[in-house]
């Protein structure tokens, strides 16, 4: 009774199509599959960025797989062939591993790469990234930003740089069609007569870095003798009402009465007859139903009532 063996996949490689971190892992079927013509061979693929503790594992019948990686670090991957138990009259058979690695060969000491990279997707409409030059680089150093997301044919360079002292320190992006809820890849590289400059790679999803505009049209409405309803409107722009969380800060007679986080555009406040002044501000943020993270907006303009008995009036701006 001969032991059934299978070879690992051939020509296993990681291919970089120039998408700044979105890589193709591809391979060919193993040699000597003739014995298993009736069989659907599967492949178990494991891959990770070098230094990561955990491998991602995929089982597939295909000869390729695509995923995003951090190109600041190397990538390692391994794959083996799986023969299901149906093919072997018994237990599953696995080949040995085929292994491969990939990295962008660095140029320059890490300190030369851009520092404090910060990207904000303002009101889910305008992406702006800014950075500081690397440490110890001269004024002749210039940085260039490239970006890619699924839907673009190739990586694009920034066409509207923000400059300081002749150096690029940021990028205003054009309208980015169908760019949210997918990985957005950025590379900032540089050049200098003086020394080599290290490239930097960044990946994020645009909906997670949204900074909305602040809420508008703040109003007061008397609900009862001891309740006041605070109302506001969502800011202008493409973000739907269901995507907002709000934080309210209310001051009563110059002392902070309450800070609260709410999911809709109203808040009911208990008051006393002694209240002489009431002020509130609101700010907004994209909530967990629409993103995994977000940035609080600036505070709205302050809306105040003062001078009349709160218990007798309906208060409108």
């Amino acid at each position: 009774d001969t032991e059934i063996k299978v070879n690992p996949p051939q020509d296993f490689e990681i291919v970089d199509p120039g998408y700044l971190g979105y890589l193709y892992l591809q391979w060919q079927p193993p040699l000597s599959l003739d014995h298993f013509k009736e069989c659907t061979v599967e492949y178990e693929l494991k891959y990770r960025n070098i230094g990561s503790e955990t491998w991602k594992t995929i089982i597939t019948k295909n000869l390729h797989y695509k995923d995003g990686f951090d190109l600041n670090k190397g990538i390692e991957a391994k794959i083996h062939t799986l023969l299901p138990w149906q093919c072997t009259n018994g237990s599953e058979v696995q080949s040995s591993w085929a292994e491969t690695t990939y990295w962008i060969s660095p140029q320059g000491i890490p300190e030369t790469k851009v520092q404090d990279m910060d990207c904000v997707y303002y009101n889910w409409q305008y992406l702006l990234c800014s950075w500081k030059p690397g440490i110890g680089v001269l004024l002749d150093t210039n940085y260039n930003l490239f970006y890619w997301y699924e839907g673009l044919d190739h990586a694009l360079q920034c066409v509207d740089y923000i400059k300081a002292d002749g150096q690029n320190i940021g990028c205003r992006f054009p309208y980015l069609e169908a760019s949210d809820y997918k990985d957005f890849y950025i590379c900032v590289n540089g050049s200098s007569e003086n020394k080599p400059i290290r490239s930097s790679y960044f990946t994020f999803q645009l909906q997670n870095i949204v900074k909305p505009l602040p809420p508008v049209y703040l109003t007061f409405t008397r609900e009862s003798s001891c309740e006041i309803k605070l109302k506001w409107s969502i800011p202008l722009g493409p973000i739907p009402a269901r995507c907002f969380d709000y934080e309210i800060e209310i001051r009563e007679d110059d002392t902070t009465l309450v800070t609260a986080t709410v999911e809709n555009e109203t808040y009911t406040l208990k008051t006393t007859n002694e209240t002489r002044q009431l002020c509130f501000v609101v700010r907004s943020k994209v909530n967990i139903y629409c993103s995994d993270d977000g940035i609080w907006s600036e505070w709205s303009d302050k809306q105040c009532w003062e001078g009349e008995d709160l218990s007798k009036k309906t208060l409108l701006r």
Epitope: G51, S105, I109, P110, E111, K195
Partner: antibody, heavy 116, light 108 residues
Framework: QVQLKQSGPGLVQPSQSLSITCTVS????????VHWVRLSPGKGLEWLGV???????DYNAAFISRLNISKDNSKSQVFFKMNSLQANDTAIYYC??????????WGQGTSVTVSS | QIVLTQSPAIMSASLGERVTMTCTAS???????LHWYQQKPGSSPKLWIF???NLASGVPARFSGSGSGTSYSLTISSMEAEDAATYYC?????????FGAGTKLELK
């Protein structure tokens, strides 16, 4: 397997120059940078400089005026030249491969004595 | 330049003993650029721990590394004879790249 083999003189006259060749195998210097580091009794390990895969270099500012690192990709060789050696340059000189912002493989070292 | 100060300069440990050595940087180093090398007499340095806490290929699991900012350490959970060597910390963050003066670990 990855190897870096160094060749160069063991004895250098004061004020003369030191030349060491690092010949690599098992990897390509068009894909990896090569660093130079020395170990001396007085100063421990000192980084001298690096030649990147693309051919550009970074030097320790303390040695920039008398150090030159170059390479020949076709021969898989990296060349180290330091001028104006003095007694305090007596050390073991190493070449090392750059990988992932570390030095993951080192040459066997070249022991250099500066003396007349 | 970033100065790395290792302590102690020399230490000895018995078989099975837990060993910890430290590396203090004169200014903050990103943890992914702080590494440790092992060197034995007559041999070249070997990459031992990279990016603060990742063991290089072939390094026994009794070794570990930790730290952040300006304070880093290398620990051996149970000293073995083959661990006697000099250990250097190294920062790859800023030019010039620098090494600590080393901690020489001897078998008691």
């Amino acid at each position: 397997q990855v190897q870096l083999k160094q060749s160069g003189p063991g004895l250098v006259q004061p004020s003369q120059s030191l030349s060491i060749t690092c010949t690599v195998s098992g990897f390509s210097i068009t894909k990896y940078g090569v660093h130079w580091v020395r170990l001396s009794p007085g100063k421990g390990l000192e980084w001298l400089g690096v030649i990147w895969s693309g051919g550009s270099t970074d030097y320790n500012a303390a040695f920039i005026s008398r150090l030159n690192i170059s390479k020949d990709n076709s021969k898989s060789q990296v060349f180290f030249k330091m001028n104006s050696l003095q007694a305090n340059d007596t050390a073991i000189y190493y070449c090392a491969r750059d990988f992932g912002d570390t030095m993951d493989y080192w040459g066997q070292g070249t022991s250099v004595t500066v003396s007349s | 330049q970033i100065v790395l100060t290792q302590s102690p300069a020399i230490m000895s440990a018995s078989l099975g003993e837990r060993v910890t050595m430290t590396c203090t940087a004169s200014s903050s180093v990103t943890s992914s650029y702080l590494h440790w090398y092992q060197q034995k007499p007559g041999s070249s340095p070997k990459l031992w721990i990279f990016s603060t806490s990742n063991l290089a290929s072939g390094v026994p699991a009794r070794f570990s590394g930790s730290g952040s900012g300006t304070s880093y350490s290398l620990t051996i959970s149970s000293m073995e004879a083959e661990d006697a060597a000099t250990y250097y910390c190294h920062q790859y963050h800023r030019s010039p790249l620098t090494f600590g003066a080393g901690t020489k670990l001897e078998l008691k």
